[in-house]
Interface confidence: low
């Protein structure tokens, strides 16, 4: 067999025996020519050296460039490849010679007493046990112990060749501690020497920097870098480092491996680079690669070296931040600078300290916002070296989703008077502004008690049918008028009023306004009968303690029985305007109550009497009335408010005052209570009268006394009393100045 | 654009059953209260049954209470009248129609022995 | 069940108006501004005229109107055309146990 490329001028040197592969018996002569062109040289099995004394290269006699090679009683081990080569070239002449020795197949090795395989647990990777055959037909098998265990070639990934030796997948003997191949001839066993099998790992796990990023030093700083390789056990590992500026003087490398606890199934290993004194040329991306042979990772970072300390905000730095109410709001102090800031949040001028709500540091956290959270916020970087400060202003806008005022009073659920003209309004609040309000509505009997569906807090109504106001067929007629903007409470609040021209079907009506963040709506029940009226006497809104009649008036020859009921707790709480019409449908929630009857010409009228009206009988009364005609009932609600008493109270102060002789003071006093005090004026504990210099006006809150006299100084006292007692203010007024002799003097 | 196919119409003898569908398309079919009316042959309309879009709630014509089930299938976009125990006055043109604003053509019920 | 009262019959000559009544009680036609009018010629479904009293939908020609006084609601078709010949039904929103009537129906004939 040829072996290497021809040259332009040379021939391969020929061999005496033209064979790829020579079988010979043991103890006979092996002996092969070699002619060529140029000086030849042997080599031969076990001995590549060429200086094993069995063997005889001897020059031939007959010619130049011939070299001959001898092997008297050649032995099993002499079985290998000869191989005739020029000096100093690839071109060889090769030819495997057997030596069949039946009692010795195997080739021992040199060391002749044991092998060493290395092997990795890898299911892909096979391992070669170099058990060559003298015979190449051998049947060989691979015993591994312990426990004992025998490997056949199958044809596939289990194989021997007599040239090679036994191939196996690795992982198959990775459980054995020693290896041997066996061959069978004419049915005596013959052994190979054992080979120790000597597990080797290759897996890393991680290779992890530290500090991993953000490395940031000025010049003359130490930069300290850890790389730590985490592998399986069984590993080497070398290291390679690569950074900007390779010829440091002051670098310092140093590689060692770390103690993990025992039973662990991981080693670690360290590399520090170390540069004593950065300059502006060691900025720049440092990689470390740790190799376990088999494989190879690597993790990088960046360092950058600063010329010197210095603070600046980044780009990506905001100016207006936009939140909606309830959100946390994050602001992040975006800055570039070493070493890193001090960083100082202000609001419109105020330092902000962190609590529970705010969290004041690189980042400005605001858990909970909310609308006074609106502003100015200011965040001030101090280079804690340099003392170098700069200065950044973030605008907070904070949204509100829409609120609708009316959904947070207690709504009535009074019914409408059939054919009458009314006024539906939401009160909306909002930033910004509602882009939209939008009215739907629905029938009444097509929404409230609906069996199928489940009443919750959230949804009170389980309508599903929701139409537009446009859509009014079968409905009221309907006029939405354009949108109205008011100042109510210090806040700018839209107002959307939809009109009912005729209230001639009992329906639920919804607004819905929408801004950029969000939705809010209310639910109005519009209930219309033609039935009873319901009055209150002699007062809309009676005080605790105070007598209220409710009356129910209705026509005569169009209604009978009529009956007054106060409806009881619902199953869930309801909410504003909320509550399911017609509550005739259902007096499971109703109680009965005790009312006088009498008439007049054309109308019966039930009145029920509440004498010293308590806060617990505040709530929503029914009139129910029955047509005499088709028996269909009637239901009108009226919710009655009961005002809780309260002891009178003064608000602001009377202030102690000197005034000139002739001048006039004016002073009030706002008192309140319920029911409302009534108000007195007292100087120097004496009531004080009205003349034609002291004026008292609007209840007595305001007392005016005109043109002061020297004997009008003294402690004045405001006084307001009501059944619950009195509260009392007082100020001493100073008059100064010589009074002027009158003429009657 | 708004289309109602009435289907299921036919001959059947007196105290026999049907079930009428209509196939709904090109609305939100679930967001509309649904009815059947009816035409006796040289008659007039009839209002039979109606169902709101969450079938919460059923109305039917007095007459016909206990014999007549309305139903729908949001999911199908359809609407079914099953008709039992039917009689000679209930031979008549069934039409399905949304709000009375949009009719389908009509499916021909005959009941006669 | 109750139904609603119309003419069985009007006739109009081209150009002409002509007013159909359809009289119901304070349940029905009186009580709510719900009354429709539907048109259907021979072997066709009907179609919506008006609704709500006298709205009109969209691609409904303005030579229909509707009007309603008391318990009766009127429909009136001017400058009356052939191709106005029909019958006509009005329906109305009742209180009574079911929520819909129909009216009698009135054949319309253009001479």
């Known amino acids: 067999a040829s072996v290497g490329l021809p040259s332009v001028s040379l021939d391969l040197p020929r061999l005496s025996i033209q064979k790829d592969i020579l079988t010979i018996k043991a103890n006979t002569t092996l002996q092969i020519t070699c002619r060529g062109q140029r000086d030849l040289d042997w080599l031969w099995p076990n001995n590549q050296s060429g200086s094993e004394q069995r063997v005889e290269v001897t020059e031939c006699s007959d010619g130049l460039f011939c070299k001959t090679l001898t092997i008297p009683k050649v032995i099993g081990n002499d079985t290998g490849a000869y191989k005739c080569f020029y000096r100093e070239t690839d071109l060889a002449s090769v030819i495997y010679v057997y030596v069949q020795d039946y009692r010795s197949p195997f080739i021992a090795s040199v060391s002749d007493q044991h092998g060493v395989v290395y092997i990795t647990e890898n299911k892909n990777k096979t391992v070669v046990i170099p058990c060559l055959g003298s015979i190449s037909n051998l049947n060989v098998s691979l015993c591994a112990r312990y426990p004992e265990k025998r490997f056949v070639p199958d044809g596939n990934r289990i194989s021997w060749d007599s040239k090679k030796g036994f191939t196996i997948p690795s992982y198959m003997i990775s459980y054995a501690g020693m290896v041997f191949c066996e061959a069978k001839i004419n049915d005596e066993s013959y052994q190979s020497i054992m080979y120790i099998v000597v597990v080797v790992g290759y897996r890393i796990y991680d290779v992890v920097l530290s500090p991993s990023h953000g490395i940031e030093l000025s010049v003359g700083e130490k930069l300290v870098l850890n790389c730590t390789a985490r592998t399986e056990l069984n590993v080497g590992i070398d290291f390679n480092w690569e950074y900007p500026s390779s010829k440091h003087q002051h670098k310092k490398l140093v590689n060692r491996d770390l103690k993990t606890q025992s039973g662990s199934e991981m080693k670690k290993f360290l590399s520090t680079l170390t540069i004593d004194g950065v300059t502006r040329s060691d900025q720049g991306l440092y990689t470390c690669a740790a190799s376990s042979g088999l494989m190879t990772k690597k993790n990088s970072t960046f360092v950058r070296v600063h010329e010197k300390p210095f603070v600046a905000f980044g780009s990506g730095m905001e100016s207006l931040v936009e939140a909606t109410v309830g959100e946390r709001v994050r602001i992040p102090a975006k800055y570039l600078g070493y070493p890193p800031p001090e960083i100082k949040w202000y609001k419109n001028g105020i330092p902000l300290e962190s609590n529970h709500t705010i969290k004041a540091g690189h980042v400005l956290t605001i858990m909970e916002v909310s609308e006074r959270d609106t502003g100015n916020y200011t965040v001030i970087l101090t280079n804690p070296i340099s003392k170098e400060k700069q200065s950044h202003v973030v605008s907070l806008v904070v949204y509100v989703p829409p609120q609708i005022g009316e959904k947070s009073l207690i709504s009535p659920v009074d019914s409408y008077q059939y054919g009458t003209t009314q006024t539906l309004t939401c009160t909306v609040y909002a930033i910004p502004p509602p882009h939209h309000i939008h009215w739907y509505w629905q029938l009444e009997e097509e929404c409230a008690n609906e069996p199928s569906q489940a009443v919750s807090v959230t949804n009170p109504y389980p309508c599903e049918e929701w139409r537009s106001v446009e859509d009014f067929q079968g409905g009221n007629k309907i006029e939405v008028n354009k949108n109205q903007f008011a100042l109510i409470e210090g806040k700018n609040k839209t107002v959307s009023t939809l009109v009912i021209q005729a209230a001639n079907v009992s329906a639920l009506y919804k607004c819905e306004a929408v801004n950029k963040v969000g939705r809010g709506e209310r639910v109005i029940s519009f209930h219309v009968t033609r039935g009873p009226e319901i009055t209150l006497q002699p007062d809309m809104q009676p005080t605790e303690q105070e007598s209220v009649s409710l009356w129910c008036t209705a026509d005569r020859s169009t209604f009978e029985n009529l009956t007054w009921y106060k409806l009881g707790p619902q199953p869930l709480p309801i909410h504003v305007g909320e509550l399911p019409t017609p509550v005739c449908k259902n007096l499971d929630t109703l109680w009965k109550l005790n009312a006088t009857m009498f008439s007049n010409s054309t109308n019966d009228i039930l009145i029920m009497e509440l004498k010293n009206a308590s806060l617990q009988d505040q709530g929503d009364y029914v009139c129910l009335a029955q047509d005499r005609k088709t028996k269909k009932r009637h239901c009108v609600v009226r919710q009655l408010t009961v005002l809780e008493r309260v002891a009178p109270t003064i608000t602001g102060n009377l202030e102690n005052q000197t005034t000139s002789i002739g001048e006039s003071i004016e002073v009030s006093c706002t008192a309140s209570g319920n029911p409302p005090p009534q108000i007195m004026w007292f100087k120097d504990n004496e009531t004080l009268v009205e003349d034609s210099g002291i004026v008292l006006k609007d209840g007595n809150r305001n007392l005016t006394i005109r043109r002061v006299r020297k004997e009008d100084e003294g402690l004045y006292t405001c006084q307001a009393c009501s059944v619950l007692g009195c509260a009392k203010v007082e100020a001493f007024f100073i008059i100064e100045g010589a009074q002027e002799k009158t003429n009657l003097e | 654009e708004v289309q109602l196919v009435e289907s299921g119409g036919g001959l059947v003898k007196p105290g026999g059953s049907l079930r009428l569908s209509c196939a709904a398309s090109?609305?939100?079919?679930?967001?509309?209260?649904m009815n059947w009316v009816r035409q006796a042959p040289g008659k007039g309309l009839e209002w039979v049954s109606s169902?709101?879009?969450?079938?919460?709630?059923?109305y039917y014509a007095d007459s016909l209470k206990g014999r007549f089930t309305i139903s729908r299938d949001n999911a199908k976009n359809s609407l079914y009248l099953q008709m039992n125990s039917l009689r000679a006055e209930d031979t008549a043109v069934y039409y399905c129609?949304?709000?009375?604003?949009?009719w389908g053509q009509g499916t021909l019920v005959t009941v006669s022995s | 069940q109750s139904v609603l009262t119309q003419p069985a019959s009007v006739s109009g000559s081209p150009g002409q108006s002509i007013t159909i009544s359809c009289t119901g009680t304070?349940?029905?036609?009186?009580?709510?501004?719900?009354v429709s009018w539907y048109q259907q010629h021979p072997g066709k479904a009907p179609k919506l005229m008006i609704y709500?009293?006298?709205n009109r939908p969209s691609g409904v020609s303005n030579r229909f109107s509707g009007s309603k006084s008391g318990n009766t609601a009127s429909l009136t078709i001017s400058g009356l055309q052939a191709e106005d010949e029909a019958d006509y039904y009005c329906?109305?929103?009742?209180?009574?146990?079911?929520?819909?009537?129909f009216g009698t129906g009135t054949k319309v004939t253009v001479l």
């Open positions: 129609a949304r709000d009375f604003g949009n």
């Open positions: 304070s349940s029905d036609v009186g009580g709510y501004n719900y």
């Open positions: 329906s109305s929103y009742t209180s009574s146990s079911t929520p819909y009537v």
């Open positions: 169902i709101s879009s969450g079938s919460s709630y059923i």
């Open positions: 709500d009293v006298s």
């Open positions: 090109g609305f939100t079919f679930s967001s509309y209260s």
